[in-house]
């Protein structure tokens, strides 16, 4: 009669929970039985983000910190079942916590838009295209961002128009701009639940051009034209 290690009821335990659950919420549980009928003590291994705790008697798993789907989902940890008393033999199983997305990331620019410029003086109103993104999950369809100017004072000089759910066009309303950098604030709304808004800045330079690029004194890089 050889003492055997505890046996988990499943190789992998899986649970699904919203990423915004309150700290202390039960997010799942595991069960194992000992062939000799001994009690089981449960513990976690590999909880690298410090998100979970397990009740060592019942095998229930609770959140102990805010969860974040954007940090990676599913979140995988190992569960160890050790027999209480006896030879303290143990077995290992997996617990996978699938985090359901909550709209908790405001929109932002999809890339670095430094270096945008128009050749000065403008011969006609100009425009440039920019792209927005966010880190939330967009099932079945892409993001549906809406775009507007970040402050009323910009409306005399600029207008923003939506191209699609992720792209918009920033256009000048006239040609009378000074030879300098303008910082254009754009408000991007993700239309989610709850809707989140990001205000981003697009730095646009009006500069003298040489062969289609901004002329800079020696030692400065040439920038490419973006209209």
């Amino acid at each position: 009669d050889v003492n055997e290690a505890p046996q988990f009821s499943q190789h992998v335990f899986q649970a699904k929970v919203s990423e915004d659950v309150a700290i202390g919420t039960k997010v799942g549980n595991v069960t194992a039985k000992d062939p000799e009928g001994l009690d089981i003590s449960y513990s976690l291994r590999g909880d690298t983000r410090g998100w979970l705790k397990i009740d060592h008697v019942t095998g229930e798993i609770f959140s102990v910190a805010p969860l974040d789907r954007e940090a990676g989902s599913p979140y995988r940890v190992q569960v160890v079942a050790t027999e209480v008393g006896g030879s303290s033999l143990s077995s290992v199983s997996e617990f996978h916590l699938i985090l359901m997305d909550v709209n908790d990331n405001p929109p932002r620019l999809a890339k670095d838009y430094t270096g945008l410029f128009f050749c000065h003086p403008l011969s006609a109103p100009g425009s440039l295209i920019f792209e927005a993104t966010d880190d939330d999950q967009h099932l079945f369809r892409g993001p549906h961002f809406t775009f507007s100017l970040g402050s009323g004072s910009l409306q005399n000089d600029w207008e923003v128009s939506k191209i699609n759910g992720t792209h918009a066009r920033l256009s000048t309303r006239h040609t009378e701009f000074e030879e300098r950098e303008y910082v254009v604030l754009i408000r991007i709304n993700d239309g989610g639940r709850p809707p989140l808004e990001g205000i981003v800045s697009l730095p646009v330079t009006f500069c003298s051009c040489v062969e289609g690029s901004c002329f800079r004194p020696a030692g400065h890089k040439h920038h490419h034209h973006h209209h």
């Epitope: 009690d39 513990s43 009740d55 060592h56 008697v57 019942t58 209480v84 008393g85």
Partner: antibody
Framework: QVQLVQSGAEVKKPGASVKVSCKAS????????IHWVRQAPGQGLEWMGA????????SYAQKFTGRVTMTVDTSTNTAYMELSSLRSEDTAVYYC??????????WGQGTMVTVSS | DIQMTQSPSSLSASVGDRVTITCRAS???????LQWYQQKPGKAPKLLIY???NLASGVPSRFSGSGSGTDFTLTISSLQPEDFATYYC?????????FGQGTKLEIK
Amino acid sequence: QVQLVQSGAEVKKPGASVKVSCKASGYTLTSNNIHWVRQAPGQGLEWMGAIYPGNGDNSYAQKFTGRVTMTVDTSTNTAYMELSSLRSEDTAVYYCARSFRRYFDVWGQGTMVTVSS
Amino acid sequence: DIQMTQSPSSLSASVGDRVTITCRASSSVSSSYLQWYQQKPGKAPKLLIYSTSNLASGVPSRFSGSGSGTDFTLTISSLQPEDFATYYCQQYSSSPSTFGQGTKLEIK
């Protein structure tokens, strides 16, 4: 026979800590979980938490998390429960109990802890 | 947390009576982890019944337990003088373990 023998009554001032011991005899402490349950005068039973003496794993009731510490000394077959930041409502009889399959089959005789200024 | 509610809170009965105490859980409890304890004044609780219906060692057969889900009962078929005490149900299906508020059984 199997028994759990607890330390004697304690009188403490508010804000102090108390450490109650529970010595197992007739069996090896590491063979079972040890639980702590308290009972305020004239009141019912309240589970405080549990410890597995084999590796020190513990589970505390949310109400006591941060104030209670359960430990064991396997060399003396003794479990301990320390409760800090005592207040008058912590006046109670504190019991240790051994569990098997989550039922408490052996209980200590209880330790009266009085918190009074 | 699972709340355990016992009824009645107190009960007067005579020797030889059949007595039933009920325990209702606020959510479903595994019958494997439902216990009953007896406590006499100045003494530690004593295990009577474990896993809903199993008699603990040395407990007389006049005690019995039954139930499932959220409703459980403790029955004493014929009260004896030594049975006058306070009775508690306990669940450990889910953490934290919780007890009923107790039922005090007194002599009529």
